[in-house]
Interface confidence: low
């Protein structure tokens, strides 16, 4: 079975203390839930009214956890340095900020004179309702989990390209005389809580995780 990604691209570090604190609050709620008589957790799918029962043991396996997936009672806070950018790859409608936290600065911190080949933007996505699993099947993502009367939302830390062409010729700093280049979003698979029929189940789903530069050699013109 594939492992979920644990490394976040440099320059897009997930606020670890914040993540750990929220995971700790989830663990506390789970301990309370386990000691409760029914030990049952009601999970609600966004847009659905019926309750789904989730076994608390679903959360016991720590190897399933990825720093890119977070269960939180409140929207995760980004670092203080944020940009108010309404940008989404593919020209779709701007992000709805009632569901998504502001994204981090499009530029990671560099030393003076250092630049990024591609600009990326990162955001905690909290309104994911469907996703593509590792086999290419569209699956329903659990939006919220109700544990011991605390509603935990499932957030995904996603990183994508801000622009396929940071400069006219493509990626920044590439010798455009010899190379064609463009920036593209790459993906990874993380374990997320999804609906499997009438119950919750962990599945690997695909999320945007980095922005890389794609190069191809320009055709050599012979005299």
């Amino acid at each position: 079975e594939p492992h979920s990604e644990s490394n976040v691209p440099a320059g897009h570090t997930i606020p670890q203390a914040h993540w750990t604190k929220l995971q700790h609050s989830l663990d506390t709620a789970l301990r309370r839930a386990r000691s409760a008589p029914a030990a049952a957790i009601a999970a609600r799918v966004a847009g659905q009214t019926r309750n789904i029962t989730v076994d608390p043991r679903l959360f016991k396996k720590r190897r399933l956890r990825s720093p890119r997936v977070l269960f939180s009672t409140q929207p995760p806070r980004e670092a203080a340095d944020t940009q108010d950018l309404d940008f989404e790859v593919g020209g779709a409608a701007p992000f709805n900020r009632t569901h998504r936290s502001k994204r981090s600065s499009s530029h990671p911190i560099f030393h003076r004179g250092e630049f990024s080949v591609c600009d990326s933007v990162s955001v905690w996505v909290g309104d994911k309702t469907t996703a593509t699993d590792i086999k290419g099947k569209e699956v329903m993502v659990l939006g919220e989990v109700n544990i011991n009367n605390s509603v935990f939302k499932q957030y995904f830390f996603e990183t994508k390209c801000r622009d396929p062409n940071p400069v006219d010729s493509g990626c920044r700093g590439i010798d455009s005389k010899h190379w064609n280049s463009y920036c593209t979003t790459t993906h990874t698979f993380v374990k997320a809580l999804t609906m499997d029929g009438k119950q919750a189940a962990w599945r690997f789903i695909r999320i945007d995780t980095a922005c890389v530069c794609v190069l191809s050699r320009k055709a050599v013109r012979r005299a």
Partner: antibody, heavy 125, light 112 residues
């Protein structure tokens, strides 16, 4: 090498049921969808439905809904397509095809990168 | 259902000459992720179909580079730069953006 080997030709009477098998090898059976496609004599391709062998999640075309049942046996790496209430217009070659979402950017079912050799079903009274 | 319309339905070609097949869909085949799910298949006489092109313009492994795909949205084209004898057969476009999956009627390529 990826291979999809289908069962042999069948001759059926109208109203009967046919069940065709598709045994796969050369890849992990539970990883990819298996689709079934009908091709009537001298006609084009028509998608009937597909199954995810890992959990037997099946999707059907409305044109065949109610008459077709697609199943998968993980223990033998074999997919099956059963078509009931046969009529003369069901005379066709039936193909199974492996749908590799890797080739389609993780589309729901589409890819069809490997096909079985086809099974001719003749419906005649 | 998404209707896929191919033209021409019959295409007589001269060996070594280019050939072009058009495919039009009744709905956009672009999905939310930005990908366009349009494939091209070749079916030689007496054989099973074979994947040539996936996602509009990506050649499947082992497919000769004389085959190329292009287009966007609802209009797509398969081009054969120089037709060879082994290219004779029926070519189908197919869409994977919407269920049920649907194919064009097919274009029969034959040598003049």
């Amino acid at each position: 090498e990826v291979q999809l080997v289908q069962s042999g030709a069948e001759v059926k009477k109208p109203g009967a049921t046919v069940k065709i098998s598709c045994k796969v090898s050369g890849y992990s059976f539970i990883t990819y969808w298996i689709s079934w496609v009908q091709q009537a004599p001298g006609k084009g391709l028509e998608w009937m439905g597909a199954i995810d062998p890992s959990d037997s999640d099946a999707r059907y075309s409305p044109s065949f809904q109610g008459r077709v049942t697609i199943t998968a046996d993980k223990s033998t790496d074999t997919a099956y397509m059963e078509l009931s209430s046969l009529r003369s217009e069901d005379t066709a070659v039936y193909y199974c095809a492996k749908s590799d979402p890797g080739y389609s950017g993780y589309s729901l079912l589409y890819g069809f990168d490997s096909w079985g050799q086809g099974t001719l079903v003749t419906v005649s009274s | 259902d998404v209707v896929m319309t191919q033209s021409p339905l019959s295409l007589p070609v001269t060996l070594g000459q280019p050939a072009s097949i058009s495919c039009r869909s009744s709905q956009s085949l672009v999905q939310r992720n930005g990908n366009t799910y349009l494939s091209w298949f070749q079916q030689r006489p007496g054989q099973s179909p074979r994947l040539l092109i996936y996602q509009v313009s990506n050649r499947y492994s082992g497919v000769p580079d004389r085959f190329s795909g292009s287009g966007s949205g609802t209009d797509f084209t398969l081009k054969i730069s120089r037709v060879e004898a082994e290219d004779v057969g029926v070519y189908y476009c197919g869409q994977g953006a919407h269920l049920p999956l649907t194919f064009g009627q097919g274009t029969k390529v034959e040598i003049k």
